[in-house]
């Protein structure tokens, strides 16, 4: 494929990544296939300035992020190391929360109201952020 | 122009607290984060934690958790750095420096005077 | 916890001199490094951000360059008024953290 230059219509392009800011809700799942097949991931916060510009942009609203540990550890959806990369809990999360009633724990990680992350049950329906690097090859065929 | 005005020296002992202010003119208050940073006699810098003026939102490093406390009063564009528990190694100048909301932007443009807390029995 | 390291942590130079002070992190933070100046008694001055942006009103003498791990402020021309202590300062990720400071003091 070709690398992309510029960012898609109605994406927001920061520091070498193109952002798309959702309106509306999905669960967890359905929002990592959304940005997926738009050639994107779910947003991967690696710093205090991208962490700042995705905030300005969703305002006080709950919003799905690239990160997860539906299987065992913390991970983010590009492979970034979690442990040795930025994060922004509130505090006391995350904390696997048992007592919502829905089963199982809390799995996916959200921007909360005030911008800090928490852990919550992945089936519900928040905006999201899909994410793509302007400096990698689309999949797109290139045009003849 | 833009100020950052803190409080004035303060001298307490051990096991105490003490409450050290900041107050903000010259620019839109709960357009920036404000940060505190400390300073040891004779020592580096040390970050403390920030809150977020709009919100109240706090984060605080792990060295300080649950002896710091950040709050503001966005009506007199002020914020506040409570340390508690006070020890000797906490005698330090104190700093609040402010970092904006929306980037890019420049972060820590503007630090205040600094506010000398002396612990002491 | 990122670790910032600087060197030297004391140079003498002259007026007129060129001086470079490099600063390293232990893990890689981009360009979200800056570079503070500070004067015994005083605030520190922010002079540099996003490892080579010059803060506003800061002059051009000053100069940062750098990304990744290994960072470098540059004076080109020693001006009696630049004898003081420079910190590097990482806000990448939390705790931000401060390099120990190099002291430029007249030879």
């Known amino acids: 494929g070709s690398e992309r230059t510029c960012c898609p219509v109605n994406w927001v392009e920061h520091e070498r990544s193109c952002y798309w800011f959702s309106r509306s809700g999905k669960a967890w799942a359905d929002a990592d296939n959304y940005c997926r097949l738009e050639d994107a991931h779910l947003v991967v916060v690696t710093s205090w300035e991208e962490q700042k510009f995705v905030q300005h942009h969703i305002g006080p609203v709950n919003t799905w992020m690239g990160l997860h540990d539906q299987n065992g550890p913390w991970k983010w959806v590009d492979g970034t190391d979690y442990e040795t990369g930025f994060k922004n809990w509130r505090p006391e999360q995350p904390d696997d929360w048992y007592g919502h009633g829905l089963g199982g724990g809390e799995d996916c990680a959200h921007f909360t109201d005030d911008g800090r992350w928490n852990d919550d049950v992945c089936q519900r329906p928040y905006r999201w952020v899909c994410e793509t690097e302007l400096d990698k090859a689309s999949q797109e065929p290139p045009l003849l | 122009q833009v100020q950052l005005v803190q409080s004035g020296a303060e001298v307490k002992k051990p096991g105490a607290s003490v409450k050290v202010s900041c107050k903000a003119s010259?620019?839109?208050?709960?357009?920036?984060?404000m940060h505190w940073v400390r300073q040891a006699p004779g020592q580096g810098l040390e970050w403390m934690g920030w809150?977020?003026?709009?919100?109240?939102?706090?984060n605080y490093a792990q060295t300080f958790q649950g002896r710091v406390t950040m709050t503001r009063d966005t009506s007199i564009s002020t914020v506040y750095m409570e340390l508690s528990r006070l020890r000797s190694d906490d005698t330090a100048v104190y700093y609040c420096?402010?970092?904006?909301?929306?980037?890019?932007?420049?972060?820590?443009?503007?630090w205040g005077q600094g506010t000398l807390v002396t612990v002491s029995s | 916890d990122i670790q910032m390291t600087q060197s030297p942590s004391s140079l003498s130079a002259s007026v007129g001199d060129r001086v470079s002070i490099t600063c390293r992190a232990s893990?890689?933070?981009?360009?979200?490094l800056a570079w503070f100046q500070q004067k015994p008694g005083k605030a520190p001055k922010s002079l540099i951000f996003a490892a080579s942006s010059l803060q506003s009103g800061v002059p051009s003498k000053f100069s940062g360059s750098g990304s990744g791990t290994d960072f470098t402020l540059t004076i080109s021309s020693l001006q009696p008024e630049d004898f003081a202590t420079y910190y590097c300062?990482?806000?990448?990720?939390?705790?931000?953290?401060f390099g120990p400071g190099t002291k430029v003091d007249i030879k």
């Open positions: 809150i977020h003026p709009n919100n109240g939102g706090t």
């Open positions: 010259g620019y839109t208050f709960t357009g920036y984060y």
């Open positions: 893990q890689g933070i981009s360009k979200y």
């Open positions: 300062q990482q806000y990448n990720s939390f705790p931000f953290t």
């Open positions: 420096a402010r970092d904006p909301v929306v980037v890019p932007a420049a972060p820590f443009d503007y």
